[in-house]
Interface confidence: medium
């Protein structure tokens, strides 16, 4: 994922749409001018803003890494959405890289869930039906998410 550039010293292009701020804020897809008098449109495919803001520049669009596919392209109001390529997945506790899915289950186990961009294959013991994650055999792995945490643009 490419990094944000903090000092592009960019000026608004003449063709960019402009409007007036509302209570000091500009709408999604815009940023505020340096004199705070007008809202300037973000550049489609280059940068974006998702909410009302008083940013002097729009946020730079994410570029998907190799090993990722672009599911949704960047618009002026939404960042790029990247997804792991087929056969790889992104773990919740390692969101920065796509890991290879396992190709099969250990002996005595059967696959109950295919590889997805968000999870590895899931195996269960034939007899007991308990899950196997590849880390702790025969123990179910519980994944919890904190309610206030926003999803990464690349997950």
């Amino acid at each position: 994922i490419t990094r944000q550039s903090l000092d592009p010293q960019r000026r608004a292009a003449p063709q960019q749409k402009r409007s007036s701020p509302t209570e000091g804020l500009c709408p999604p897809g815009h940023h505020i001018s340096e004199d705070s008098r007008e809202c300037i449109s973000c550049k489609y495919g280059q940068d974006y803003s998702t909410h009302w803001n008083d940013f002097l520049f729009c946020l730079r669009c994410t570029k998907c890494d190799s090993g990722e596919v672009e599911v949704n392209s960047c618009t002026t109001t939404r960042n790029t959405v990247c997804q792991c390529e087929e056969g790889t997945f992104r773990e919740e506790d390692s969101p920065e890289i796509c890991r290879k899915c396992r190709t099969g289950c250990p002996r005595g186990m059967v696959k109950v869930k295919d590889c997805t961009p968000w999870s590895d294959i899931e195996c269960v013991h034939k007899e007991s039906g308990t899950k196997h994650t590849g880390e702790v055999p025969a123990v179910e792995k519980t994944v919890t998410t904190s309610p206030g945490t926003p999803a990464s643009p690349c997950s």
């Epitope: 010293q9 909410h51 803001n53 946020l59």
Partner: antibody, heavy 121, light 111 residues
């Protein structure tokens, strides 16, 4: 390349005054909010205050607003911090910083190397 | 003032493992869909360097091993895999309102 050169630090007696300077280069100084942040030896970071490009808005951390005065001279690309009534707890490394673009206030994208102020009798 | 509480105060992580640093704000630092929380790295004898801004945006030139997440009052900086050069003190900072404040810092040691 954005650069800051702080100066004016040194040994000062309790109750005394000192004026720190920060000369900026590598960007259009007159367009940017500027801040001072300090760090006592072995301690964390404390924001002192900031000044807008036209010097008509100056914000301070409440506990310091009666002892410190922030000013700037855009013609000289220089930021100042006038320290008065200093005490031993003002002993710190004083950093000149430039905020980044977004929001008001924003985060501190660029920092100088700092100038050390030691308050001691 | 918004108080930022970082935990742990120090941690030691083996090379290649994950370092997780938390920062809790005394009130929400999110507004209008943005989280005004930023992360810095400071090495001995150097000024702080911004790593992540607005909760999750990686600054220019910062390796993708660093990631930030969170909203409201709870924020996390993750470093994975940890490298030798990551030994430093890490600070969170909010800019939700005045005055901006910093967390107390987390010292990361590499085992």
């Amino acid at each position: 390349e954005v650069k800051f050169l702080e100066s004016g630090g040194g040994l000062v007696q309790p109750g005394g005054s000192l004026k720190l300077s920060c000369v900026a280069s590598g960007f259009d100084f007159s367009r940017y909010w500027m801040s001072w942040v300090r760090q006592a030896p072995g301690k964390g970071l404390e924001w002192i205050g900031e000044i807008n490009p036209d010097s008509n808005t100056i914000n301070y951390t409440p506990s310091l607003k009666d002892k410190f005065i922030i000013s700037r001279d855009n013609a000289k690309n220089t930021l100042y911090l006038q320290m008065t009534k200093v005490r031993s707890e003002d002993t710190a490394l004083y950093y000149c910083t430039r905020r980044a673009y977004y929001g008001n206030p924003a985060w501190f994208a660029y920092w100088g190397q700092g100038t050390l102020v030691t308050v001691s009798a | 003032d918004i108080v930022l509480t970082q935990s742990p105060a120090s941690l030691a992580v083996s090379l290649g493992q994950r370092a997780t640093i938390s920062c809790r704000a005394s009130k929400s630092v999110s507004s209008s869909g943005y989280s005004y929380m930023h992360w810095y790295q400071q090495k001995p004898g150097q000024p702080p360097k911004v790593l992540i801004f607005l909760s999750s945006n990686l600054d220019s030139g910062v390796p993708a091993r660093f990631s930030g997440s969170g909203s409201g009052t709870d924020f996390t900086l993750n470093i994975h895999p940890v490298e030798d050069g990551d030994a430093a003190t890490y600070y969170c900072q909010h800019s939700r309102d005045l005055p901006p404040t910093f967390g107390g810092g987390t010292k990361l040691e590499i085992k």
